[in-house]
């Protein structure tokens, strides 16, 4: 029985050219986390494997940094980075837990005026 829950940063915004931390946290379960995958739509960004450590996809290696923790830092943001991001926790024996984050990358002038998504 899967008892765990994923807490995420929810809906977030960031400035074009800046960076953002995508963060998920798995709670309410004693299951062992074997691997966390970070995906954007159907594209793999990075993997953190419990035994083998961090693995960044080739197409993102210059703009993605591992951490903090099991989170992921996106750098040099562009408007094209706007969209859904998923943290996929592979656990034993529970199975798979998925969290969703929506990121909007704003033009710097808009971001300066304080436009923000509210975290539900």
């Amino acid at each position: 029985m899967m008892t765990g829950t994923i807490e995420t940063t929810g809906n977030i915004s960031a400035e074009k050219g800046g960076s953002i931390i995508l963060q998920c946290h798995l709670s309410s379960t004693t299951a062992q986390v074997t691997q966390v995958n970070w995906e954007q739509q159907d594209q793999l960004l990075a993997i953190c494997n419990a035994d083998l450590g961090w693995h960044i996809s080739p197409s993102f290696k210059d703009r993605v940094a591992p951490g903090p923790g099991l989170g992921l830092t996106l750098q040099s943001l562009t408007v094209n980075d706007t969209g859904e991001y998923f943290c996929i926790y592979h656990t034993y024996p529970d199975g798979t837990y998925t969290g969703r984050i929506f990121l909007e990358v704003l033009e710097s002038s808009v971001a300066e005026h304080g436009a923000r998504f509210q975290i539900p």
Epitope: L44, I47, N49, D51, G53, H55, I56, H90
Partner: antibody, heavy 123, light 109 residues
Framework: QVQLQESGPGLVKPSQTLSLTCTVS??????????WGWIRQPPGKGLEWIGS???????YYNPSLKSRVTISVDTSKNQFSLKLSSVTAADTAVYYC???????????????WGQGTMVTVSS | EIVLTQSPGTLSLSPGERATLSCRAS???????LAWYQQKPGQAPRLLIY???SRATGIPDRFSGSGSGTDFTLTISRLEPEDFAVYYC??????????FGGGTKVEIK
Amino acid sequence: QVQLQESGPGLVKPSQTLSLTCTVSGGSIESGVYYWGWIRQPPGKGLEWIGSIYYSGSTYYNPSLKSRVTISVDTSKNQFSLKLSSVTAADTAVYYCARDGVLTLNKRSFDIWGQGTMVTVSS
Amino acid sequence: EIVLTQSPGTLSLSPGERATLSCRASQSVSSSYLAWYQQKPGQAPRLLIYGASSRATGIPDRFSGSGSGTDFTLTISRLEPEDFAVYYCQQHTVRPPLTFGGGTKVEIK
């Protein structure tokens, strides 16, 4: 589809270093999800995993061979290589390269293999 | 390391018969990490089953895998002439390291 091909000397002298290369065709070695591995099989015996490498250079090795093994990758040539030092007759085997799905979790396996190359250690 | 013991060492059967191959692990293995391979003389191994029970691409449905924990089974429902080969199980953990079983030879009776 992805294909693998081993190459290297078929004869190595005792105490020397065995060197093999695996060329990946039909796909990029710079995969976000796959490692690339080496497995060997002495004549008439079973399979023994040697070690595997990620495109970034991250490796994991069989502890029983780790002190003698170096696996490296050359993404510009779409190749990865094996070096096994201080060889003896016991290292005589068919050496295979294969695609390692260790990061795929529920599909962990060696799903694509090269044809293998026989290496004999003898003076 | 996890030792995989395959039995029997040799299985002598006729075409059309059912083959049952056993793989026993010295300690528990996640079924997600258990694979089976077929190897014919002079050829590289070919992946048959991954995740203990999922058939790899292009593998006929007469091949099936089952099991969990320490006991796993490969079943060939009706042996075809091309199925006579050596079969290996393999566990794909990182720590302790991945290992192969010693193999089961399926030969024509």
